[in-house]
């Protein structure tokens, strides 16, 4: 079976879209008008793996660019980087396990649970224009929760 | 929790059309990536996929029997449908559904077991 | 279609034995292969995907390898509640699954 795709941008609870900031790195801001256009649109892979009650294995690509989110260890903490792979073996229905967040899609709300590690999630800051990371912590401060937008292929 | 639960008539006659309800509950399709398969079994065979529907309404068939099959679903009332046409006594098995995100499935319905006989 | 051609069909063994089932797919299927254990009157279980990751609760007794066309389900040391019957299934093509080994007290 193939992998099969969707391509999407995804929102903050705050209403921050996602944006590039240098070549390896997403910031959240809040966009107007014309400048929406400079969110990133996602290419989420829905891939094998373990699936629990209300999560989805998937791998979160930016399209038409041979980039994917992905979590390491840096300094000994699980880090969200962009990694680049090479475009010919990616997607794939086996997905190295950085690179695979468990979506957790309740009431329209998304949450993306990094696979390498468990209870770290994909989160945003409060304040504006600040990077896109991995926090390892959910209802406190920082953002964890999502809107996707579906894009048109 | 995830539960599936399958529901149909226990006997249909040959030639007759079965119509076969899958309901769910702990998850929802419209939830993107999610997917529900009908798979069947004889009593004491083997088990065979028929048919898988996804969130998008995308559909999948078994190529031996696609022309026979129709899948779909009630996103709201959290039903999953399978229609077979023509049936034959060789449709009699207990016919489950699963849940799927891909074509591994974790959870299984307690299945229902149908007799096609005149 | 992938034909999965699992053996033995049939298996007596006793409780602490290792045991070892296997199937072959008649064409490449990668890694996309599952395994499943069946009791009389009930549903599937999941044990393994990917022809060797063990699914969530499965108890570490059970491990699957192979790639390709060639697959394995180990028991390494059989407990009395795995006598059951187990089947195979890839899914690198639409579904299809073996025939199923019984596996009986010996």
């Known amino acids: 079976a193939p992998v099969r795709s969707l391509n999407c941008t995804l929102r903050d609870s705050q209403q921050k879209s996602l944006v590039m900031s240098g070549p390896y790195e997403l910031k959240a801001l809040h966009l107007q008008g014309q400048d929406m256009e400079q969110q990133v649109v996602f290419s989420m892979s829905f891939v094998q793996g373990e699936e629990s009650n209300d999560k989805i294995p998937v791998a979160l690509g930016l399209k038409e660019k041979n980039l994917y989110l992905s979590c390491v260890l840096k300094d000994d903490k699980p880090t969200l980087q962009l990694e680049s792979v090479d475009p010919k073996n990616y997607p794939k229905k086996k997905m190295e396990k950085r690179f695979v967040f468990n979506k957790i899609e309740i009431n329209n709300k998304l949450e993306f649970e990094s696979a390498q590690f468990p209870n770290w999630y994909i989160s945003t800051s409060q304040a504006e224009n600040m990077p896109v990371f991995l926090g390892g912590t959910k209802g406190g401060q920082d953002i964890t929760d999502f809107t996707m937008q579906f894009v048109s292929s | 929790q995830v539960t599936l639960k399958e529901s149909g008539p226990a006997l249909v006659k040959p030639t007759q059309t079965l119509t076969l309800t899958c309901t769910f509950s702990?998850?929802?399709?419209?939830?993107?990536?999610?997917?529900v398969s009908w798979i069947r079994q004889p009593s004491g065979k083997a088990l065979e996929w028929l048919a898988h529907i996804y969130w998008d309404d995308d559909k999948r068939y078994s190529p031996s029997l696609k022309s026979r099959l129709t899948i779909s679903k009630d996103t709201s009332s959290n039903q999953v449908f399978l229609t077979i046409t023509n049936v034959d006594p060789v449709d009699t098995a207990t016919y489950y559904c699963?849940?799927?995100?891909?074509?591994?499935?974790?959870?299984w319905g307690q299945g229902t077991l149908v007799s096609v006989s005149a | 279609d992938i034909q999965m051609t699992q053996s033995p069909s049939s298996l007596s063994a006793s409780v602490g034995d290792r045991v070892r089932i296997t199937c072959r797919a008649s064409q490449d299927v990668d890694t996309d292969v599952a395994w499943y254990q069946q009791k009389p009157g009930k549903a599937p279980k999941l044990l393994i995907y990917w022809a060797s990751t063990l699914q969530s609760g499965v108890p570490s007794r059970f491990s699957g390898s192979g790639s390709g066309t060639d697959f394995t389900l180990t028991i390494s040391s059989l407990q009395p509640e795995d006598f059951a019957t187990y089947y195979c299934q890839q899914y690198s093509s639409y579904p299809t699954f073996g025939a199923g080994t019984k596996l009986e007290l010996k």
């Open positions: 702990g998850f929802s399709l419209s939830t993107s990536g999610m997917g």
């Open positions: 699963a849940r799927s995100a891909y074509y591994s499935f974790a959870y």
